[in-house]
């Protein structure tokens, strides 16, 4: 028997520095977790102790903190090289800055193979990107060889900016021939490494003949066997075992997100490359694991540029940006409008001639807007200003909801109106009218939404049975501020870009902004 140790990360999302337990900015260092310096300590410890070790990443290193905003992927290549990753799969967020923003900082600089079997380049891009990412890679590990085949969510064109010259094929259809090719090369130990979410990971384990292990990402799935060491609730045991259509037991793993855990899976293979056993657990990278001094010193060196960036002007406002709780928790506020407009703008994807865009709606809890920005400072808006408005380090995500769920969400928005509570929704692409004289749960008297399947966008009444795409904060997608109906009833959830980054990009693009209060949210006469 031959034993392989797979160390894996996914959805690190720019958390190069240690973070607090909830993966936001580290405040009390003695209680902080993750970060590449701490990760390196643990990886090196395992590499020294065990003979056959692979360090893999299942995508979405890009996007999530100011590190990505400033360094644009150069930081990913640099520190992943320093940690000596063996391979990485492309995630949807790796395309956030377009194909050029993937090629130059990461694909050309990475010293490890970057993989995806279901992304096919065409047109002029085909020759430019040839060999920079691969469908699979075979690595010698001790006295054996291991094949690693990559995959990426086929939803990427709706979630990021891959352009028109990359085709995202069905994962299973694309993986099978590559795995078959590996078999002809006499590679009989094959890992599928990819970024399509836990459901697809399980399908790959079930359907792709020859895949021995699946290491996934995208859905931030936490798996654990035994008592979990932190706040995350396991979605299943680690590894999650799938019985393949040809009767094999295939371990599937994922390691939550944000570099908080290091996935640790030990696989035992027989001489024919069959998995005999698999066991392990994610390792919580808490403060009991010291940060590696040399990586930490490097992080501190790279940090300097971030501090400078925070105070640079992104753009100007010529109006007061009202982000006060007195406004945003009670009525339409122009800061809410600005943020929602930025959220929609960040999700412009012309992927279908029938649609002017795939999504037109935004909702945003007023309690998530934490500060106004005064225009009487020469109109200057900095990252620092925006960090005061959006201090929680969240993301603006894409969900699919039924109209009936949206109606419940808007009822919840005003179910206890007047108490300055955070659930009051700011909107974009939505016109809502409330009648507060009616009883809670029946206060939405008009709810019109902007069409997407139209050449001239206009507002139409919400249809209860129709499925709508909506951009909202991850906080709401996870049921925050009492929006349990969103969490329970959402049909799809894809994590998006860092909230501050979305707004800062929009302001930089617009250069001068002047958001107004324009009647998106109204109260019917006599009640307010």
């Amino acid at each position: 028997a031959w034993e392989l140790t797979i160390l894996h990360t996914n959805d690190v999302h720019s958390r190069l520095e240690q973070t607090s337990e909830d993966s936001s900015k580290c405040v009390n260092a003695s209680r902080c977790m993750g970060g590449v310096a701490r990760l390196f300590t643990k990886v090196q410890q395992i590499r020294r102790a065990e003979p056959n070790v692979l360090l893999l990443d299942a995508g979405d290193q890009y996007q999530g903190t100011i590190w990505f905003t400033v360094y644009k992927g150069a930081e990913v290549a640099h520190f992943m090289n320093a940690l000596r990753y063996d391979a990485m799969a492309l995630g949807n967020h790796e395309f956030d800055n377009g194909v050029e923003g993937l090629i130059e900082p990461l694909l050309k600089e990475a010293k490890f193979p970057i993989l995806s079997a279901n992304i096919k380049a065409k047109g002029p891009l085909a020759s430019q990107i040839s060999g920079l990412y691969l469908p699979y890679k075979v690595l010698p590990v001790g006295d054996e060889v291991v094949g690693i085949v990559g995959y990426t969510s086929k939803e990427t064109p709706f979630l990021s900016n891959p352009g028109t010259n990359l085709v995202f094929e069905d994962e299973i259809t694309a993986l099978q021939p590559e795995v078959d090719k590996l078999k002809t090369l006499n590679v009989n130990k094959i890992i599928a490494l990819g970024h399509s979410g836990f459901e697809m990971d399980k399908l790959i384990a079930q359907k792709v003949r020859g895949v021995d292990v699946v290491v996934g990402g995208h859905s931030n799935t936490f798996l654990y066997t035994g008592n979990p060491p932190s706040k995350e609730v396991p979605a299943g045991k680690y590894p999650f075992i799938v019985t393949s259509d040809d009767g094999r037991k295939v371990p599937v793993v994922q390691a939550y997100a944000f570099g908080k855990y290091l996935g640790y899976l030990k696989i035992e293979f027989d001489e024919r490359g069959n998995v005999i056993s698999s066991h392990g657990n994610p390792i919580l990278l808490n403060s009991s694991i010291p940060e590696d001094p040399s990586i930490k010193a490097d992080i501190n060196k790279w940090r300097i540029k971030l501090d400078n960036y925070s105070t640079q002007e992104l753009g100007k406002t010529i109006v007061y940006l009202d982000g006060s709780s007195q406004s945003c928790r009670f009525r339409e506020c122009n800061m809410g409008n600005l943020i929602c407009d930025a959220m929609i703008n960040n999700n412009l994807r012309h992927t279908d001639e029938m649609f002017w865009n795939h999504v037109s709606m935004c909702i945003l809890n007023g309690g998530g807007i934490r500060s106004p920005i005064d225009e009487r400072n020469n109109g200057t808006i900095t990252w620092e200003n925006l960090a005061a408005v959006l201090p929680f380090g969240g993301t603006f995500d894409l969900v699919q909801l039924k109209g009936s769920t949206l109606k419940k969400a808007f009822e919840h928005s005003v179910h206890r109106y007047g108490q300055s509570t955070g659930e009051f929704l700011q909107v974009g692409g939505i016109h809502v009218v409330y009648d507060l004289s009616r009883k809670p749960g029946d206060r939405v008297v008009k709810l019109d939404v902007l069409c997407t399947k139209c050449r001239v966008p206009s507002y139409d009444p919400l249809k209860m049975d129709e499925v709508y795409k909506v951009i909202l904060p991850n906080f709401l997608a996870n049921g925050g501020d009492g929006f349990q109906m969103i969490k329970d009833e959402l049909l799809r959830h894809d994590s998006g870009d860092q909230d501050i980054n979305v707004v800062s990009t929009y302001i930089s693009k617009m250069k001068v902004i002047y958001p107004a209060v324009e009647g998106r949210i109204k109260f019917s006469t006599g009640s307010h």
Epitope: N81, D86, K111, F112, P140, D143, E144, N186, E271
Partner: antibody
Framework: QVQLQQSGAGLVKPGASVKLSCKAS????????MHWVKQRPGQGLEWIGM????????NNNEKFKNKATLTVDKSSNTAYMQLSSLTSEDSAVYYC????????????????WGQGTSVTVSS | DIVMTQSQKFMSTTVGDRVSITCKAS??????VAWYQQKPGQSPKLLIY???DRYTGVPDRLTGSGSGTDFTLTISNVQSEDLADYFC??????????FGSGTKLVIQ
Amino acid sequence: QVQLQQSGAGLVKPGASVKLSCKASGYTFTNYWMHWVKQRPGQGLEWIGMIHPNSGSTNNNEKFKNKATLTVDKSSNTAYMQLSSLTSEDSAVYYCARFFFGGYPHYYALDYWGQGTSVTVSS
Amino acid sequence: DIVMTQSQKFMSTTVGDRVSITCKASQNVGTAVAWYQQKPGQSPKLLIYSASDRYTGVPDRLTGSGSGTDFTLTISNVQSEDLADYFCQQYSSFPLFTFGSGTKLVIQ
């Protein structure tokens, strides 16, 4: 010092088989992959395949799949390559070479080579 | 399969000169390239790995460079003992290796 000693030249008839040997010394035989490379007279180098003496794991160039069989004898620190159904196309010098890999980024190269075995296929 | 093309079959030089031998990969291979020297009647010897790392004992007159698809082996201050065939090899497609067809260095 590291040495790879290959068996002597051979004249073989078409259709026959030949087993070439490569005896390793000066290093731990079971720690390194062994590769085999073909060189036809006045031609370039062609990679045939590799074997790891510890596990017996092999990988072959598809072109040589039905031509070359790689084996090892750990007790004598010897790697073997059997060539079957020989034709004039198989007339060449065959080298064994030690595979050296490691570091970061992963680098691979053939750092020690045997002196080569000349095989001539003729009736 | 990745093809390694050494378009110059022969290169003529004189002692003390500097010569550059080139090798082109049919697709991007990063820096996964090695160079070998084969003197007449001898087996090949490793010179360069990872496109630019000199193997132990190789004189610093020999330098490897390049990444992606274009690679060069440069010999400065050419000596008579440099008369040999030079082969490039890619290992990006491990476990398949391919060699270039070779360039013969002729010293006038």
